[in-house]
Structures are given as C-alpha cells and as structure tokens.
C-alpha cells in the first residue's frame, strides 16, 4: 500500500507539521494608502512573520493547498461622526480571496458595524472589529483585508490592527 | 540523512501532535483583584483546562517554544456611564507578553472600545471584546490579559470572559 | 515499545493530521426558523464544508473526542430599535453543547451586546458578534449557535454569519 509504505511521505508529513503554514501581519503607517486597494501590512518587523506563506501587495499568498483559519482585527476610531457616517455608511471590514479562476475578489468573511454612535457624549469614539474563520485555499491563491472606510482604521503600533492565518 | 532516518523523531512528532499545547481559562469571582495587575483565571473547574501549558498569577506559561494562537474575550457591562466613560476613558483590552529578556510587558494584541453609550434608552449596557492572533513564544514566556477598566469586566460564570491558546 | 514500534499508528497519525476535523458552516435564508431553536446552517454550498465532523439540525457533531477551537460570528442589524429592545433585551449570542450526559444544553461561550443604540443619527444600525474558544468534546457531542433575538441576525450571503470548528 503506497500510503502505508512510503517512509518519505511520513517524513514529509512530519516536516510539514513542523512548519505548518502560519503568518501574522501587523498594521503600519503605510498600511492604508487611501487608494481604494486592500490594506497593506508589515511582514517582518516586530510581531510580524511569514512561515510557509507568501506576501504580495497586501495579500497573504498560499504555497500549499488546504484549509486555513484566517483572521483579521482592525481598530476603528474617529473624532465625531464624519458627515453621514452613522446614517449612510456603516464600516465594512472583510477578508476577500483573489484567485486566477475568477476575475473578481470573492467575499470570505465580512462584518458591518455602526460604530460612531457608540460614544454617548464624546466626540472621540473607538471600536474594534474581529473576523476569523476556516476557508479552503488552493496553492497560489491570495487573501486580502479591506475596510471601505479605511480612514477610520487606526494602525499605529501593529497590535491594534492585524491580519493572519494558519493551516488547520 | 539525519532528518529522514530518525524513527525517534517521527515518534516524537506524533506524540507532540497528540498533546499539542492548548489551554482555555475562564473567568471567576476572583479574576479581578482591583490591584492593577492582570486578570486572574480559573484553570481547572468547569470548562477550564491546561494541556502542555502552565499557569502562574494570571499568566499562561509556555513549556515549549513555537507559534501560538492566543485569544481572549471579555464581557463588558455597566450601569450608565458614571465615569464619563465615553468621554474620558475608552476600555482597553489587551494580551501582553512577559519575558525575562525585557523588564516590561510587551503589547501583543490590543483593542479599544467606547462601549457605554451603546444602549439607546437603557441604563444597563453590554459589550464584548474579542482578541485573537498568532504570536511566537519562547519556552517559559508568559502571556497575560489586562483590561484597564477591570471593574467593567463581567467574570462570574466562566462563559463570558475567558483566555486561551493553542500551538499552530 | 508498542508506542514506538507501531508503523500503523504512525501512518494513522499522518492520516488523521491530513484529515484533522474541521468545518465552516455559513448562514442562509433558512438559518433562522423563528422557532426558538438554534440557528441552522448551510453545510455544502459556497464556502461551507464538513471534514471529519457531522451536522444535524443546526449542530456540529463530533466524530472523535478531543479539544476543538469552536467559533461563530453573527451579523446583527436592524432599523431603529424595536419597541423596547434597548430597554428589554441585550442581544445574547452563544455557543452551547448538547450531550447525552445532561438533559439541558450547556453554555460554552457567550456574549451579550447592546447594539441598537450604536448608530447616533441613523435608524439603521449594524453590529457584529464574534465568539471563539477551545473546548473539549467527546465523540457524538453536539455544538449549536443560539441568538435569542434571532430576528436581528442578518444571514444573507454566508460571509456575515457563520459557525465553525477545528481540532487543535
């Protein structure tokens, strides 16, 4: 039986477990470019790392197919409610997949929030949005984070807004 | 080839997978001591457990180096905003690392919220803050949970405020 | 030594790692039946899948004992505050265990929120609740998601409200 007889396969299983793909990317001053693109991330400094995953223009890129728990947190904050924010635009935070098999990004995990009415008597408000879930990714597929109202994302020091994944 | 030739290493890999470090700690009446220290946790009763991780004065302590998904949820609640809370003090919930290599705790994952203005016509308000992310920890390093406004954390029954980790 | 000498066990370890239990279930129009039961989920279409876990009437069902990271997100939303909502009921979102060993469901992870006061000048409000944590489950035990105020859960396209688990 090929499945039971291959020492190399077992070794490979051990190796892959040893280096099971994982990544944690952190917010940085350059994360929000204001261009309507996805958020960009720090990949090496401080708490950020890539292990068995690649990075390209804001995207985590898989090197092997499998099920991944992907997650992102964004710190939201503002002074007052930008004209019409509470009325017109909830804040949408989402994780999206890019694949060569489709021309458009696919929604994976999405949240909407109406944050700026939260602080009763204050002009300053804070909110946080967390997303996490298991998705199947083929090798070479990409995952990005988007916040439509990206001017409300507080990036600062890398602990408040971040993006990561690991194989399950 | 040493990597492919070691039966013991393969067995060890299997054993370690079998008992991959994991923990889930729960809130209890004694969780908030009001001393400005980290939150304290139940480690054995009910849903709480430790597997391949230690516990000391509120901290999860690693016994082996690696990448860990660490998480915490705190249930926030109160009656009105006596602090002028929305104005003066957002609630800050964070996971912090203690290591012998640095004298001070290091921020790992942090959220800020302005919760107490949330309930429109109610004096009583509730909010919840979830944090989770992958960090690298050396053996013997510690992770703690802090909430600056710890009196606003509801700890009582163990399902609403908790703290955990597992190796990825 | 049986533990070190069993080729079959090693192979099984590889196989089980290859197919470590995992699932991600997504919201659908039929998720909320308005019957007071748990939320129901899509198990096959789109992003939904089951791998080494079963599904029955809203519940993820384990096929093997172990520690599982279980998670759920629900997208909440409404138009204004239904008469007395802020006054009457915070929104409670929870993960609960069903086991043949107890007649009643057991709370595992729970959040309460006061969402509908969040949008300051808007009749429309959005909020999102995320829960995740590690629990021990025996084979055949079930986990369900409940939101007491299920009419406020927005299910739509499967990316905003979901439920999943994986073995750690």
């Amino acid at each position: 039986d090929q499945d039971t007889g291959s020492w190399e396969q077992l070794v490979q299983a051990r190796r892959s477990h040893k280096a099971s793909p994982a990544a944690h990317l952190t917010g940085a001053n350059s994360s929000s470019m204001g261009t309507g693109g996805p958020l960009l991330w720090e990949t090496q400094l401080g708490l950020a790392f890539l292990r068995g995953l690649g990075y390209h223009d804001g995207a985590l890129v898989t090197t092997q197919a499998g099920y991944y728990y992907i997650y992102s947190k964004v710190q939201l904050g503002g002074v007052g409610c930008p004209q019409g924010l509470a009325t017109d635009l909830p804040v949408t935070h989402g994780l999206y997949k890019r694949t060569t098999r489709y021309p458009e990004e696919l929604e994976l995990l999405v949240s909407r929030r109406s944050p700026c009415g939260r602080a009763a008597s204050s002009r300053v408000w804070w909110d946080s949005s967390f997303l996490g879930g298991v998705v199947h990714l083929e090798a070479g597929e990409e995952v990005v984070v988007r916040v439509l109202e990206e001017q409300l994302v507080r990036l600062r020091d890398g602990t408040r807004s971040y993006f990561g994944a690991f194989m399950v | 080839d040493q990597d492919t030739g070691s039966w013991e290493q393969l067995v060890q890999a299997r054993r370690s997978h079998k008992a991959s470090p994991a923990a889930h700690l729960t809130g209890a009446n004694s969780s908030s001591m009001g001393t400005g220290g980290p939150l304290l946790w139940e480690t054995q009763l009910g849903l709480a457990f430790l597997r391949g991780l230690g516990y000391h004065d509120g901290a999860l302590v690693t016994t082996q180096a690696g990448y860990y998904y660490i998480y915490s949820k705190v249930q926030l609640g109160g009656v009105g905003c006596p602090q002028g809370l929305a104005t003066d003090l957002p609630v800050t919930h964070g996971l912090y690392k203690r290591t012998t290599r640095y004298p001070e705790e290091l921020e790992l994952l942090v959220s800020r919220r302005s919760p107490c203005g949330r309930a429109a016509s109610s004096r009583v308000w509730w909010d919840s803050s979830f944090l989770g992310g992958v960090v690298h920890l050396e053996a013997g390093e510690e992770v703690v949970v802090r909430v600056l406004e710890e009196q606003l954390v509801r700890l009582r029954d163990g399902t609403r405020s908790y703290f955990g980790a597992f190796m990825v | 030594d049986q533990d070190t000498g069993s080729w079959e066990q090693l192979v099984q370890a590889r196989r089980s790692h290859k197919a470590s239990p995992a699932a991600h279930l997504t919201g659908a129009n039929s998720s909320s039946m308005g019957t007071g039961g748990p939320l129901l989920w899509e198990t096959q279409l789109g992003l939904a899948f089951l791998r080494g876990l079963g599904y029955h009437d809203g519940a993820l069902v384990t096929t093997q004992a172990g520690y599982y990271y279980i998670y759920s997100k629900v997208q909440l939303g409404g138009v204004g505050c239904p008469q007395g909502l802020a006054t009457d009921l915070p929104v409670t979102h929870g993960l609960y265990k069903r086991t043949t060993r107890y007649p009643e469901e057991l709370e595992l992870l729970v959040s309460r929120r006061s969402p509908c006061g969040r949008a300051a000048s808007s009749r429309v409000w959005w909020d999102s609740s995320f829960l995740g944590g590690v629990v021990h489950l025996e084979a055949g035990e079930e986990v369900v998601v409940r939101v007491l105020e299920e009419q406020l859960v927005r299910l739509r396209d499967g990316t905003r409200s979901y439920f999943g688990a994986f073995m750690v």
Partner: antibody, heavy 121, light 107 residues
C-alpha cells in the same frame, strides 16, 4: 466598608430650598458608582430623586427635574442634593445610597440611615 | 416611566412558611431588577440584584427569579427577622422606579 451619612436641616419653609449633604467614608467617591438620592414620604413607598457620578454626570427623575440639582465635592468626598420650591408634598425621609455600576455587581448596596425633612412654615 | 406592580400588597405568614412575592414590570427590563427589605425606621437593605443574584451576606433562604417583565422573590423558610416590607426596583431605564411594596406580617 463604605458608609454614608446624610446631614442638613430637618425643617424647610414652603417655597424654600431643601439642601442635604451625604458624606462618604471608608471609600472614595471617585469610583465606578452612582451616588443616589431616594426619598420616602411618611407611610409611603420609595421614590428615586436622581443620581450623580464623581465626574459630575447627573440623571434626575423627570417628575422633579425642574427643581433638582445634584453635585459632587471630590475634595470632601461628599455629594449633595438641592430641591427648590418645596411644598408639604416634599416632606419625607431622604436617603442617600450608592449604586454599583460595574459589570458583575449592580444594585444600591449601601444606604445612609436617612434624615427626616419636614416642609412647614 | 416603567411601572412595577407588586403582589400581594400585604400577606400574613408564619415562621417556617415558604413565601413568594411577585413583581410585574409594565415593559421588559431584562434582568435589571433588585429586591430590598425594609424594617420600620431603617433604610432599605439590598437582598437580590440582577433579578437572581444574592447580595453578599444575605441568607440563602432568599432567592430571586425571572426576566423580562415577571419576577419573583422567594423566602424558603420564614424566620422572625424576615417580617418587614419588601420592594422591587428596576434599574434598567430612567427614571429608576420602585414597586409599591409588599408588607409581610406575622400570622
């Protein structure tokens, strides 16, 4: 152990102003609490007058709002009540009470002994 | 304002009896209800908060239940010191309101 003690005149003339102070001992007024005033007319039930926090936030009973003022003196660790344009209907025992405003423990758990105020000419 | 209606307004019972007092809110208040005991010439004493949580130092003979609009205070076995007036209070929304009271007398 927090204790509360009301003080103020026991007799007030009609149309005058009722002024009471509640001294907080055994704890700080600058904690996550509401500091309340509740009154009880002779032989009747309890009526909430209003609350104040250490940061000066106030909430009053709408039935009394136009006549009530509450304030906090953090330096003296005390809070006070002023009720103007009083009538005989304001004759009551006046209590001050602490309400815990934290997540795990709500409720008015500490009360003063009460002070009787009579409105009469 | 939310109205709280207690029943009965008064009752007579004997030492050792099990007694139940109910409190109905005019609209839902979640679990934001407290129960107080008051003896003549004394301030109210907090017994139960959040509808069912026993205040520290209060005898476990007292218990509370309910959520939404209907609440109950139960005294499992009356003792001589339990004869007093009992009030429910909602603290969920402004203004804070109290029930009219239930007077518990010795039979």
């Amino acid at each position: 152990q927090v204790q509360l003690q009301e003080s103020g005149p026991g007799l007030v003339k009609p149309s005058g102003t009722l002024s009471l102070t509640c001294a907080v001992s055994g704890g700080s007024i600058s904690s996550i609490n509401w500091w309340n005033w509740v009154r009880q007319p002779p032989g009747k039930g309890l009526e909430w007058i209003g609350e104040v926090s250490h940061s000066g936030i106030t909430n009053y009973n709408p039935s009394l709002k136009s006549r009530v003022t509450m304030s906090v003196d953090k330096a003296k660790n005390q809070f006070s009540l002023k009720l103007n344009s009083v009538t005989a209907a304001d004759t009551a025992v006046y209590y001050c009470a602490r309400e815990r405003a934290v997540a795990d423990y709500h409720g008015m758990d500490v009360w003063g002994q009460g002070t009787t105020v009579t409105v009469s000419s | 304002a939310i109205q709280l209606t207690q029943s009965p307004s008064s009752l007579s019972a004997s030492v050792g009896d099990r007694v139940t007092i109910t409190c109905r809110a005019s609209q839902g208040i979640s679990s934001a209800l407290a129960w107080f005991q008051q003896k003549p010439g004394k301030p109210p004493k907090l017994l139960i908060f959040d509808a069912s949580d026993l205040e520290s130092g209060v005898s476990s003979r007292f218990s509370g239940s309910g959520s939404g609009t209907d609440f109950t205070l139960t005294i499992s076995s009356l003792q001589p010191g339990d004869f007093a007036t009992y009030y429910c209070q909602q603290f969920n929304s402004y203004p804070i309101t109290f029930g009219q009271g239930t007077r518990l007398e010795i039979k």
